[in-house]
Each structure stands twice: as C-alpha cells, then as structure tokens.
Interface confidence: low
C-alpha cells in the first residue's frame, strides 16, 4: 500500500507568493511559493495519486504583515480551503499567548491541531479540552494513517505560552501515544512535529512504532540529487535513521516560508512496515501557475493589509537616527530602538533566579535601512518601519561562548570608517573600541548585563561562559562576515518578523524617546 | 445606527447611462467594502462589484466589466455606482450593501434604486 | 464561476412548521455561506454567515448547517414574520454568487 506525504513546515505566513529568498515577491515572473500555487500543485497530486495526506509542521504563525493584521485568522481561512489534513503546533503559534492561538485557529481549523507533549492545566484545561489533540487517526483510502504530533519543549523560552501549559519531553510524551495507536490496530504512524532536525532524527530513532517523521522548526533543507534552487541540502531526502529496534524510519522536512512542498511517497506492507521511501521536496516556483480562485480571495484578504499599513501604530518625539553615517559609524538612537524593542519581545520570566533568560542584543548597522523624522507629527506607521527594516527578516535566539561574541565585536570594526554594515548596534552590552590598535584586537572592553540577577548591572564579558543573544537572522546565518556566529553557535531559534517585533514594542510604548547613551564608546 | 441611504428611482432611454449613489452613515465608513448588488423584477439577486473605499481597490464582476464604474467620494461617506449602455435587461432595483472587508457577506443594504429601461 | 442551486424553489407550510432549504455550491467554498431574507418591497437581510454564525438580533428558530459544497438553513418553528424568500450566497470566489431563491409561502 502507497502513500503519498505531502508537507509544509514553518510557513511563516508566506501567504502571498514571495522572491526567491522569501522576502516581499517584486518581480511575479520569477516568483515562488504562496498558497495559491501550492493549492495547484496539491490538487495536481491529489488528482493523480490515490492515497494522499497534507500535512503541516508548525510555525504557520508569525512572519509577514498578514499575520500581524490577521492574527492567525488567515491560517486557518486558508489552510481549511487547501484541505490540510493536520497540523501540529510549533513554538510560534503561541505567539499572542494561547487566546491568540485558540480564538483564530484552533476554534477555526477544519483539520486537526496535534501535540502530545503540550498538557494544559488549571482553568485552561477545560477551556483548551478537544481544541488540540495527541494524535488523530486519519481514513486514506481503505487504510488508516496514525498522526501524533509534537512541539518544542523550549517553546517557553521562545514564545508566550503563559503558565497553564507544560510542555514536557517529547521522547517520554510520545512513546505512550504511538502505543496507545498500537492498541487501537494503527500499524502506520507519522510523527509530525516542530522540535528541529536533531530531535526529529532521535524521534525516529527512539520512539518504537512510529514509521515517518515529518518535521519542521530548523527549516532543513534535504534533497536527493541537484538542488533546484540556492538552499544547499543538509542531507538526502528523506533522511534515513536506523531506529533502535533496527528499523529504517525516514524523516523529512520541506525547508521554510512556503517554497517547497515535501513530497514523501511510502510503500507499507501488510503488517503496516515501511518497505521503501522516495521523494524530494517540489520548488514552488512560476512553472507552477496560481490557482484562480485561491488567488483572488488571498486579493481579497490584501485590501485589509494595504489599509493597515498607514495606520498609526505609535509616535516619536525624537528624530529616529537610522541613517548609514551614524548606524555604520556610532551608537545610534535607531539602533538602540530596534535592540530594545527585541529584547523586550524576548521578555519570558521563566526562573525565580534570573529577571530574564536573555539580556543582550546584537543588530549590524547595516540593516538599518533609513531614519524617521519625527517631524510628521511623530507618527510611526508600519510603512515607515518597512523602509528601516525592508528585508523581511526575524530576530532570532543563539546561544554563544563569550568568545565568540568577543570575535563578532572584533569584526565589527575590522575595517572601520568604511561605512561597512557590519558594524554593531547593540542592546544589554557596553563595548569600547581603540581605533589605534590594530584589527582583530579593537576591542578594549566589553560588559554585558547579567541575567541571573535581581538586579540587573553590566559585568566583564566571560570567555568561557554560554551566553543567549538576540540578534537578526541575517547574523545567525553569518551575514555581513560573521562567520564565526554561524561556524560556533551552540543553538539557534527562529524569532518574531523584525518589523512585527518593533512595531509591538512602539504600540505598546506609545511614546518613543531613545536617545544616545554610551552603550557604544571610542577610548 | 448603520445607514446606508441610495438615491430615488430612475427612468433611462437604451444607450443611456445611469449613476446611482449610496450615502453611508453610522460607521467608519474606509473600513468596509461598499458592494452594488441587483434583483431584475421577479428575479434572483446578482452581484456586480464592490469598492474599498480605504483605497479605492475595486472588484467587478467579469459580466459587468467594461460598463460598470464605481467611484467614492470619502469626504460625503458617498459611494456610485454608473451603468452605461443600458438596455432594457438592465431594469432592476439596483442595492448597495456593505461587506466587511475580508469576509463578503452583506450585513446592511441600502432601501434599493428602481433603474428603469424603456425607450 | 461558482454556481449556487437552491431547491426548492417554493415551499407552503404552516405556522409552527419546521422548515429545511438546501443550497448546493459547484465546488467547494469552505463554508463562506451567508443566508438572506427578502420580503417584497424590501431589501435583503443578512440571516446568518460562516454557515453557522447568527447575525445579530435574528432570532435563535434559524440555524444553520453543512460543509463542502452543501449547506442547509432550518427555521425550527416557523413564525407569521417569517414568510419571505430566501437566499444563499456564497462569499468564497469572485463572483459572489446568490442562489436562485426558495420562496416561503403559508400553506
């Protein structure tokens, strides 16, 4: 018996079609992704394949001006009208706490909502009851399929949860589940979750039963054969993992934003064992024409956003210095803005003894794209937001030794007064820099501010010691020469869209006045 | 309360045009699509097209295109509807009714403008 | 296009009855179905949306139900105001389209 996996993971409301490194589409012809080319190529196989299942793994929520103005209303509008048949949750649903996640998507879904190592409790309980479930058993064809779904137990720390979920491992939260499915006669089990590649490979490798694993969260890319586009495979597709039981379980994932769509064909035997895996995931790009009807209700649905845009979202009594001859040069106030508005998105009281998980903010000046000139009234618009922060990045979450934080504050000025983008603005961190010494050995201190503190103050970075920075996908990725960010991170997180996470921030502060304070000093 | 206030009936020649206006009240009226709807005596309803007025985004139906003009007058809350080229098939009561802007059902209608076609 | 068949076209009942329309879509529309009440002389009004949702102030006897491309509005007990026609239309692709009308009569 054959069975076709079709999967999704980390959208990132890409609803509209977009460029091909998934930013605002700009030229249609040379355009990818979008739900309405993806319900072409869906309808396509679902007409020429008999037992077909699209699936998604999380992270649909946060990423584009859609979901901002929406709020997951359009997740659920369009996944239902694509016919998903599950979904599970990742960290980003949580996004605008659990009423944000209940209220749009789960009350609103025609398809199931899985996640079996997320248990509510307390009054939320009976509010959440049925909303999402463990797992859900799906009629294909004259089979059933088991889907159990699971989500990243770091969620806490990387979205707004609140206190009345617990997510718990999701090794010890599966097992039970796949064998309650056993028990119910389901002998083909997918494991569809939002943990990253790792996890999904140790899923497969401990979890006895499941047969598949499809993933999300790490926006891996894998491929069998020549890469169509400029993602460069982690691996092949699928992946294949020897269980501990000696069975061979493949784990795919579809890369990010929409412009793949994975496609796992898998041949079971009577006994419901996995007898072979193929596929590859399908670049979404303009050979594949946009489905009529989907399109013009995604036209539909644009009205709202272009409205949106010129709204008020709060006002300066400042000029917001965004221009390259201060951000490339010095601490400018525009810098600071954007480090506090990001650290302030990353607010999670999660432990008695630290005030915060993370403190610290690292943003390259040049990413900061133009100022705002206060004298329009103050007012901030999320148009005005869209010129300082154009490229439709995330502000993601790392782990880092000091020193590699000490190596990227070197970098910053390696080439000094050559108006270069690599410069760092920064947030939580003191530096001074000594012109007159000579590259990669700059940087004559550097403190940073604790977060196991009651009282938060700056202390002398440490070498040796693991630190949590926020900072732009861009740099995580090594953007602007900061290799050693990509070549030493110990973990990295997928954050809020940078644009989402300032305008938030001036919204919720009303009244904006950064200012220029010493966080970057010359000796 | 929601009002939406069209103009008294009409008696046009073939070949004639005719500009219907619909005068909102009661609401913030750049959020909401303003719809043109029609019902042929005795007949069914029919959709014609609808106009954002928060930007001016217009949607016509594919049978309309080319005779139908809907333009908005933001400082009046006033949205028209012009048909051109009538003929007598065009004889209807002619409703503007508003629709929320990602969801096009009808929550409030005009009271319906008698078009009349007769040579 | 997306066509909307309504049946039946007309129906008598009596006061108290339980009445059923159906409105059949060409394809799918995702449950964007909204009904309509007209009486003659009058616009329509706006009965339910979302297949389920009750428009405010209209009473809790009409209900509505269906997915896919089927969908039915019940009024559980029929009242003396509730003689009119009826509409469906659907608000899933442009064109939004109405459904020919199912005339409510006392039998």
């Known amino acids: 018996w054959e069975l076709t996996i079709l999967h999704t993971n980390d959208v990132h409301s890409r609803l509209e079609q977009t460029s091909e490194d998934s930013s605002k589409c700009v030229n249609a012809s040379r355009c990818m992704g979008g739900v309405a080319r993806l319900f072409t190529k869906v309808q396509q196989i679902r007409r020429a394949e008999p037992n077909v299942l699209l699936l998604d793994a999380g992270d649909q929520y946060q990423g584009t001006i859609w979901f901002t103005v929406y709020k997951g209303a359009e997740v659920a509008h369009f996944m239902n009208a694509l016919r998903y048949d599950a979904m599970a949750l990742g960290n980003h649903e949580f996004d605008n706490g659990v009423e944000g996640l209940i209220e749009p998507l789960l009350k609103e879904a025609k398809f199931p909502i899985l996640s079996a190592n997320i248990k509510a409790k307390g009054p939320l309980a009976s509010q959440i009851s049925g909303l999402y479930l463990p797992y859900k058993v799906l009629p294909v064809g004259d089979e059933v399929v088991g889907i159990v779904g699971y989500t990243s137990k770091e969620t806490p720390f990387l979205s707004n949860p609140g206190t009345n979920l617990v997510f718990e491992d999701e090794i010890t939260a599966l097992q039970p589940e796949v064998d309650k499915l056993k028990t119910l006669n389901v002998n083909k089990i997918i494991a569809l979750g939002h943990s990253g590649f790792e996890m999904d490979k140790l899923i497969a490798q401990k979890v006895r039963g499941v047969d598949v694993v499809v993933g999300g969260h790490s926006n891996t890319f894998l491929y069998t054969g020549n890469p169509p586009s400029k993602e460069v495979p982690a691996g092949k597709y699928p992946f294949i993992v020897t269980s501990d039981d000696g069975r061979k379980v493949p784990v795919v994932q579809a890369y990010a934003f929409g412009k793949y769509l994975g496609y796992l064909k898998i041949e079971f035997d009577e006994r419901g064992n996995v007898i072979s895996s193929h596929g590859n995931p399908i670049l979404l790009n303009s050979s594949i024409p946009e489905d009529p009807s989907i399109k013009a209700d995604i036209n539909k649905w644009r009205i709202k956003l272009d409205n949106y845009s010129t709204q008020e979202l709060g006002k300066t009594i400042v000029y917001l210095d965004g221009s390259s001859q201060s951000c490339r040069f010095r601490e400018c106030n525009m810098g600071n803005l954007i480090c506090d508005a990001m650290i302030n998105n990353n607010l999670r009281h999660t432990d008695e003894m630290f005030w915060n998980h993370v403190s610290m903010c690292i943003l390259n000046g040049g990413g900061i794209r133009s100022p705002i000139d206060e004298r329009n009234n103050g007012t901030i618009t999320w148009e005005n937001l869209a010129a300082v922060l154009p490229f439709g990045g995330t502000f993601d979450l790392v782990q880092l030794k000091g020193s590699t934080l000490k190596k990227a504050f070197e970098h910053s000025v390696h080439r000094y007064g050559q108006s270069t983008g690599e410069f760092l603005q920064v947030g939580g961190i003191h530096v001074v820099y000594d012109l007159s010494r000579k590259p990669g050995d700059r940087v004559v201190k550097l403190d940073v501010l604790c977060t196991k503190c009651r009282v938060p103050s700056y202390d002398p970075l440490k070498m040796d010691e693991v630190y949590k920075v926020i900072l732009p996908n861009f740099l995580a990725n090594g953007g602007d020469g900061f290799q050693m960010i990509k070549d030493e991170l110990l973990r990295h997180d997928s954050g809020d869209q940078d644009i989402n996470v300032v305008s938030t921030y001036i919204s919720k502060m009303k009244v904006i006045y950064p200012a220029v304070e010493g966080r970057i000093k010359f000796s | 309360q929601v009002q939406l206030v069209q103009s008294g009936a009409e008696v046009k020649k073939p070949g004639a045009s005719v500009k219907v206006s619909c005068k909102a009240s009661?609401?913030?009226?750049?959020?909401?699509?303003m719809h043109w709807v029609r019902q042929a005596p005795g007949q069914g309803l029919e959709w014609m097209g609808a106009?954002?007025?928060?930007?001016?985004?217009?949607s016509y139906a594919q049978k309309f295109q080319g005779r139908v003009t809907m333009t908005v007058d933001t400082s009046t809350s006033t949205v028209y509807m012009e048909l051109s080229s009538l003929r007598s098939e065009d004889t209807a009561v002619y409703y503007c009714?508003?629709?929320?802007?990602?969801?096009?059902?009808?929550?409030?209608w005009g009271q319906g403008t008698l078009v009349t076609v007769s040579s | 296009d997306i066509q909307m068949t309504q049946s039946p076209s007309s129906l008598s009942a009596s006061v108290g009855d339980r009445v059923t329309i159906t409105c059949k879509a060409s394809?799918?529309?995702?449950?964007?179905l909204a009904w309509y009440q007209q009486k003659p002389g009058k616009a329509p009004k706006l009965l339910l949306y979302?297949?389920?949702s009750l428009e405010t102030g209209v009473p809790s006897r009409f209900s509505g139900s269906g997915s896919g491309t089927d969908y039915t509005l019940t009024i559980s007990s029929l009242q003396p105001e509730d003689f009119a026609t009826y509409y469906c239309?659907?608000?899933?692709?442009?064109?939004?389209?109405f459904g020919g009308g199912t005339k409510v009569e006392i039998k």
């Open positions: 009661g609401y913030t009226f750049t959020t909401y699509n």
């Open positions: 239309q659907q608000y899933w692709s442009i064109p939004w389209t």
């Open positions: 979302g297949v389920i």
């Open positions: 106009i954002f007025p928060g930007n001016g985004h217009i």
């Open positions: 009714a508003r629709g929320d802007y990602d969801e096009s059902y009808f929550d409030y």
């Open positions: 394809e799918g529309i995702y449950n964007r």
